[in-house]
């Protein structure tokens, strides 16, 4: 469905800034990019270009079954958790438990959800109860965001919990999808 396949492990991502510069704040930031034929706005990257090679963010993937009351998903879903502190890429270990976490003395960078995706799940219920269909919201990617002491509370609400709801993610697509094409893809996927 346009999202990269997840491995059931920890991975390290380094944001690439050069690709999508931020538009000036006074402009609608998606005048063209948020049109259906262009696939929507690009990923949001919160720091300047000079930080690109300096900071990395950890995405932890784990698989679990989804439940709704007594009902459980027929298949497990792969969830993503954005892990703790951001630090210079060269100091972050490739696997959990190796190396030391870097703690910044200057501005605080936090690893937080950047985008979410929705995934259809079918829930099987006990006692002959009819199955249920739900769409579960899952984190699709993480980002490093710079915090300073000048951030106000409304800007800090991003960081309430690691599972806080992230920004919706739009992936570039060549044109708007028709109902027919979308349905066919879904039938193939499920």
């Amino acid at each position: 469905q346009g999202w990269q396949a997840f491995k059931n492990d920890a991975t390290e991502i380094i944001p690439e800034l050069g690709e999508y510069p931020e538009p000036p704040p006074e402009l609608e930031n998606n005048k063209t990019m948020n049109r259906a034929e262009n696939g929507g706005r690009p990923p949001h990257h919160p720091f300047e270009t000079k930080d690109v090679s300096e900071y990395s963010c950890r995405e932890l993937h784990f698989t679990r079954y989804v439940t709704d009351g007594p009902c459980r998903s027929a298949k497990p879903v792969t969830e993503l958790v954005c892990s703790g502190q951001c630090g210079p890429a060269r100091l972050l270990p490739n696997a959990i438990g190796r190396g030391k976490w870097w703690r910044p003395s200057g501005p605080d960078f936090r690893c937080i959800p950047d985008r979410y995706r929705a995934q259809r799940v079918q829930l099987l219920c006990p006692g002959g109860e009819a199955p249920r269909a739900r769409k579960v919201r899952l984190v699709a990617s993480c980002k490093c965001k710079r915090l300073t002491r000048f951030h106000n509370q409304s800007e800090l609400k991003d960081f309430g919990t690691e599972a806080a709801r992230p920004q919706k993610g739009r992936k570039p697509r060549p044109r708007a999808r028709s109902a027919k094409a979308n349905q066919a893809e879904l039938e193939n996927a499920y």
Partner: antibody, heavy 121, light 109 residues
Framework: EVQLVQSGAEVKKPGASVKVSCKVS????????MHWVRQAPGKGLEWMGG????????IYAQKFQGRVTMTEDTSTDTAYMELSSLRSEDTAVYYC??????????????WGQGTLVTVSS | QAVVTQEPSLTVSPGGTVTLTCGSS?????????PYWFQQKPGQAPRTLIS???DKHSWTPARFSGSLLGGKAALTLSGAQPEDEAEYYC?????????FGGGTKLTVL
């Protein structure tokens, strides 16, 4: 609690365009999936399009393809729906509607108050 | 595009039970259409009663329930109240494209 406040009523001439705004408060727009629905006087609801988080993009109803553009200004948490080449049959109340925060994805949970667009020569 | 059909009008007595249905021109309605039900009163915006076939919202009165019946989505109102008089719309998800039914005018008489 998510609240949606829409722009005021508009009167347009056939062939013109209209841009309806929908201001989000209580949440940030970038975290919501916004949809647009219209209702002609005395008629039923009609889905125009919206953001689909399964595929990560906007999807427009076939009927409106090429005439409608949905955009968002995340700096002001305002969504816009622009409809061009207006005809008299586009006279309707236009609603914005979003999903709700939670583990399950559920659309159309919060609705704006509606914006009446009248197309008349 | 699919066409979603509902009964144009239904009448129920106060305290009575009524079932509104929602069919699809493409075949049987299933849980994979994630049926939604909305209530709309004159001069007001719609409000969601049911999502995903049977999932009620915090504001949905207990007397409303959603299900699938005979290849259609169904909204059952048990113990109708005068305030339930309204227009009811169903909505089906066709893989990211949504289609509303024509609406059912429910009269509590």
């Amino acid at each position: 609690e998510v609240q949606l406040v829409q722009s005021g009523a508009e009167v347009k001439k056939p062939g013109a365009s209209v841009k309806v705004s929908c201001k989000v408060s209580g949440y940030t727009l970038s975290e919501l999936s916004m949809h647009w629905v219209r209702q002609a006087p005395g008629k039923g609801l009609e889905w125009m399009g919206g953001f689909d988080p399964e595929v990560g993009e906007l999807i427009y109803a076939q009927k409106f393809q090429g005439r409608v553009t949905m955009t968002e200004d995340t700096s002001t948490d305002t969504a816009y729906m622009e409809l061009s080449s207006l005809r008299s049959e586009d006279t309707a109340v236009y609603y914005c509607a979003t999903d709700t925060d939670g583990y399950w994805e559920k659309f159309f949970q919060h609705w704006g108050q509606g914006t009446l667009v009248t197309v008349s020569s | 595009q699919a066409v979603v059909t509902q009964e144009p009008s239904l009448t129920v007595s106060p305290g009575g039970t009524v079932t509104l249905t929602c069919g699809s021109s493409t075949g049987a309605v299933t849980i994979d259409h994630y049926p939604y039900w909305f209530q709309q009163k004159p001069g007001q915006a719609p409000r969601t009663l049911i999502s995903d076939t049977d999932d009620k919202h915090s504001w949905t009165p207990a007397r409303f329930s959603g299900s699938l019946l005979g290849g259609k989505a169904a909204l059952t109102l048990s113990g109708a109240q005068p305030e339930d008089e309204a227009e009811y719309y169903c909505l089906l998800d066709y893989g990211g494209t949504f289609v509303f039914g024509g609406g059912t005018k429910l009269t509590v008489l």
